[in-house]
């Protein structure tokens, strides 16, 4: 299936040009999306190109500026947040990145009624997290690991927690491992729907071993960065959940929410919190051995001012074939009765589907079914449930939005997006206004991305929010590569792949092949999305064929494929890449003497193992920031898939699956190893150990480190990295510079 054919015709050939590496590094062909910042059923805010904050009313068609760029500029604001009562706006400046989601910033409060900043009782700086209550204009914020509450922006703050301490106790914000591997947020506090209560997590990292690395900076002596970071098998953070009444915070103070007994009996995690009503909350817990999850619904007891979590309101989700959930355990979406909910989990055939739980999980009513997967529940209203899936035309790498009418019986299903712009748009997400009165669709490809606004009742398109016209025009004289998404059937396994082909691809010729791999559990690389990136350039200008393959362990194709790698990371992912390469060679247009593989992070691990597989298939390869031993990576992630590195659990496979154990096998390949020295995620230690093993085995290899760079290798390092990798590949493939 040709998804993005090159627009090359002989008559035009001389006016068309190939992509250059400069195009990619400059972001010349980047696209824009439009996500409305909904403030009601029919209104949204958007930051205009000239930096005014503009309110749009869909029904009147009117728009007006609520905050001028002058006000934004006066405090160098890069972000904003309107209070639900529309009285105030917080302005965020001095953004300072910490980890993947976390950052600190300075916050100013602007009074919209008076057109001036709130003076008196200003907020301290820098703040770790700040948010408005869902109703009114109360503020909760985290400063120096403690939580504070303001009834109004100009009021003095009420301090909720006092035990916060850097790297020891975290209140209302996650520690490193919870941020990266469990919550995927910068915050760990949650307002109840009407702002009566505030729930928060406390993480105690006192006993967690610390990763320490040098940050070289510009000073005479490097700084040492210390992060409590539990590696596989190490001591984990201890988590507790508290709830405080924000109307009378001093009355009884924070009340702890009890942990279900079956969870509390051994090491456990808190995985998410969902408010149902102001007096009902749902907590999800997970055993450290992550195949048992418990969803616990708790109620406020007015008489005792405590939270009660009856055993009858505990719902257990267990996996017998792998870990609980997909990448994370899914979260519930409650219906209007405030007790029943919709949730995605595996059905009896091993496909993730939407289920409706009214009393017990055993009696769950399956809402979707088939040999495909429901991926996300966007919104449940009185009469509709909106979700995304990869059902349409049986392509796992697509995402379409569906509506199920739950108000009628039997429920009817409609695909909202399947036929809208069928060639251009096959991968969607959505953003809904209050009560799903309106919604925005954001299409990511395979054509040029487009964002549109729709009526939530009729699904009619109201207007285009962003269609990337400039990008479309800029691409008119570019020879883009061709892309195709197809599948291989091998030994009862379906291997979906994306192949990126040079613009003048000719099946009768031979091309060098580059495999780009990620391959981590519950990931997906073969997606019908638009991208003009480094591999597009390699195909367009350098005439390479690039392939991405989703093997065992990848997502959205059922549990058989997903859980195949359970407790055996580093085996089948590599095997499936190798199998695919052999199949590509059989297609007849691959030069089998010029095959390379590269990957980043988990992909660096897989590419390293593939290079060291001893197959002789690969001439060369690159590993960027690879994991080299699962003993070096984070407990929450690693143990989910590998169990514990103990003799009575899975230590043997932890030892067998290292890159170092295969050092000898790198002798006959050209290997480029790359890592940032300030990688907080996959520590430089991983590459240091690979390098040491290769040196000890007297195996030659190439390496590049990026001083003071983290796992993302951003800024000028990005340019250097891709330039360096390009030279390496061109040399490997004997392509002239």
């Amino acid at each position: 299936i040709v998804l993005r054919p090159s627009r090359v015709h002989n008559s035009e050939e001389n006016t068309m040009r190939a992509l250059t590496l400069k195009d990619i590094l400059n972001g010349t062909f980047s696209y824009k999306t439009f996500f409305p910042n909904w403030i009601s059923g029919q209104e949204y805010l958007h930051q205009s190109a000239d930096n005014n904050i503009v309110l749009y009313n869909i029904e009147t068609g009117q728009s007006y500026t609520i905050l001028s760029n002058r006000t934004m500029k006066s405090v160098n604001a890069s972000n904003y947040g309107l209070s639900p009562d529309r009285q105030f706006v917080y302005l965020e400046s001095d953004y300072s990145k910490l980890w993947r989601y976390s950052y600190t910033a300075t916050y100013y409060i602007y009074d919209l009624s008076n057109g001036e900043f709130v003076r008196g009782n200003e907020l301290p700086r820098p703040i770790q997290y700040l948010c408005w209550s869902p109703v009114g204009s109360k503020l909760a914020y985290v400063y120096q690991n403690n939580i504070y509450l303001k009834q109004r922006p100009g009021d003095p703050p009420f301090q909720i927690t006092f035990n916060g301490r850097e790297n020891k106790i975290f209140n209302g914000i996650p520690d490193w491992v919870y941020e990266e591997e469990m919550l995927a947020t910068k915050y760990a506090l949650w307002w109840s729907p009407n702002g009566k209560f505030l729930a928060y997590a406390e993480f105690n990292d006192t006993d967690i071993p610390v990763i320490a690395y040098s940050y070289y900076g510009d000073e005479q002596y490097p700084r040492t960065i210390n992060i409590p970071y539990p590696k596989a098998g190490a001591k984990n953070p201890v988590v507790r959940i508290f709830i405080i009444d924000t109307t009378y915070p001093a009355y009884v103070g924070p009340q702890e929410v009890p942990v279900p007994a079956m969870i509390a009996s051994s090491d456990y995690y808190f995985s998410w919190l969902t408010w149902v009503t102001d007096e009902r909350v749902c907590l999800q817990w997970l055993k450290r051995v992550q195949n048992v999850s418990v969803l616990s619904i708790c109620d406020f007891r007015e008489d005792w001012q405590t939270w009660d979590c009856p055993k009858t309101q505990e719902h257990i989700e267990e996996s017998r074939t792998g870990w609980a959930g997909g990448f994370f355990v899914s979260t519930p979406v409650f219906s209007y009765d405030a007790i029943s909910y919709y949730k995605i989990f595996s059905d009896k055939d091993g496909y993730k589907h939407i289920h409706y739980i009214k009393d017990t999980v055993e009696n769950a009513i399956q809402i979707t079914s088939g040999k495909w997967e429901a991926i996300n529940i966007f919104r449940v209203t009185q009469d509709s449930l909106f979700y995304s899936s990869n059902e349409f035309e049986e392509y796992p790498g697509r995402r379409n939005i569906y509506r199920i009418s739950i108000g009628s019986y039997p429920p009817s299903k409609k695909c909202v997006t399947c036929h809208l712009r069928k060639e251009r748009c096959q991968y969607y997400t959505a953003s809904f206004s209050d009560y799903a009165k309106y919604y925005a669709l954001v299409c990511y490809g395979p054509g040029i991305p487009i964002s549109t606004l729709h009526d939530g009742r009729t699904d009619q398109e109201i207007k285009i929010l962003e269609e990337n016209k400039e990008l479309e025009n800029a691409l008119k004289n570019i020879q883009l590569p061709k892309e195709e998404i197809k599948k291989l059937e091998v030994d009862e396994i379906t291997l979906w792949y994306k192949m990126i082909l040079p613009p003048q691809f000719d099946r009768s010729k031979k091309y060098p092949l580059l495999i780009q791999v990620y391959g981590g559990p519950c990931s997906q690389s073969v997606r019908s999305v638009f991208a003009v990136n480094w591999i597009s350039y390699l195909a367009s200008k350098e005439g390479m064929v690039i392939a991405l393959v989703d093997g065992r362990g990848t997502a959205f194709q059922g549990d058989k494929l997903l859980y195949a790698v359970y407790r055996k990371l580093g085996v089948y992912e590599v095997e499936d890449q190798i199998t695919a390469v052999r199949k590509f060679i059989e297609m007849g247009f691959i030069d089998e003497k010029r095959i390379a593989i590269w990957g980043w992070s988990y992909g660096g691990y897989v590419s390293s193992l593939a290079l060291a597989s001893g197959t002789g298939l690969f001439k060369c390869g690159i590993a960027v920031a690879p994991v080299s031993s699962w003993e070096y990576y984070a407990s929450v992630y690693t143990e989910r898939f590998m169990g514990l590195p103990t003799k009575d659990d899975n230590l043997e496979h932890y030892k067998n699956s290292t890159v170092m154990a295969r050092a000898e096998y790198f002798r006959n390949v050209d290997y480029l190893l790359i890592h940032g020295t300030a990688d907080d995620n996959v520590h430089f230690q991983n590459s240091a150990q690979i390098a040491k093993a290769l040196v000890n085995a007297q195996v030659d290899f190439q390496a590049m480190w990026y001083s003071d760079q983290n796992h993302g290798l951003s800024g000028l390092s990005t340019n250097h990295l891709y330039t360096h990798m390009t030279h390496f590949l061109k040399q490997c493939f004997s392509l002239s510079d």
Epitope: S40, N52, E59, T60, Y64, I66, S68, L112
Partner: nanobody, 115 residues
Framework: QVQLQESGGGLVQAGGSLRLSCVAS???????MGWYRQVPGKQREWVAG???????MYTESVKGRFTISRDNAENTVFLQMNNLKSEDTAVYYC??????????WGQGTQVTVSS
């Protein structure tokens, strides 16, 4: 630019009621509108808001006593004020909710609650 004309203020005993009206020239149709008030020498404060779909919101101190409503056909927004207290004494304004920038305010209407 929307022109706004407030009316209905007056002198009233504590515990009494008043109904304020705000007529917008040009169409407000289903735009969100709000009532605001200002005591001399103090900051203007928001009192109540109503969206096009008639979702209402109130500042804590007037909840249960004030009711905001609208008549789109007449381009009018109302504020029914019951059980008035002396601290409700102020000049009352209506405007877009939130106000636009640059902001346009009407003359307002004076509400005085005597005890």
């Amino acid at each position: 630019q929307v022109q706004l004309q407030e009316s209905g203020g007056g002198l009233v005993q504590a515990g009494g009621s008043l109904r304020l009206s705000c007529v917008a020239s040009g169409t407000i149709s289903s735009g969100a509108m709000g009532w605001y008030r200002q005591v001399p020498g103090k900051q203007r404060e928001w009192v109540a808001g109503i969206t096009g779909s008639r979702t209402t919101m109130y500042t804590e101190s007037v909840k249960g006593r004030f009711t905001i409503s609208r008549d789109n056909a007449e381009n009018t927004v109302f504020l029914q004020m019951n059980n008035l207290k002396s601290e409700d004494t102020a000049v009352y304004y209506c405007n877009l909710w939130p106000p636009s920038r640059p902001d346009y305010w009407g003359q307002g209407t004076q509400v005085t609650v005597s005890s």
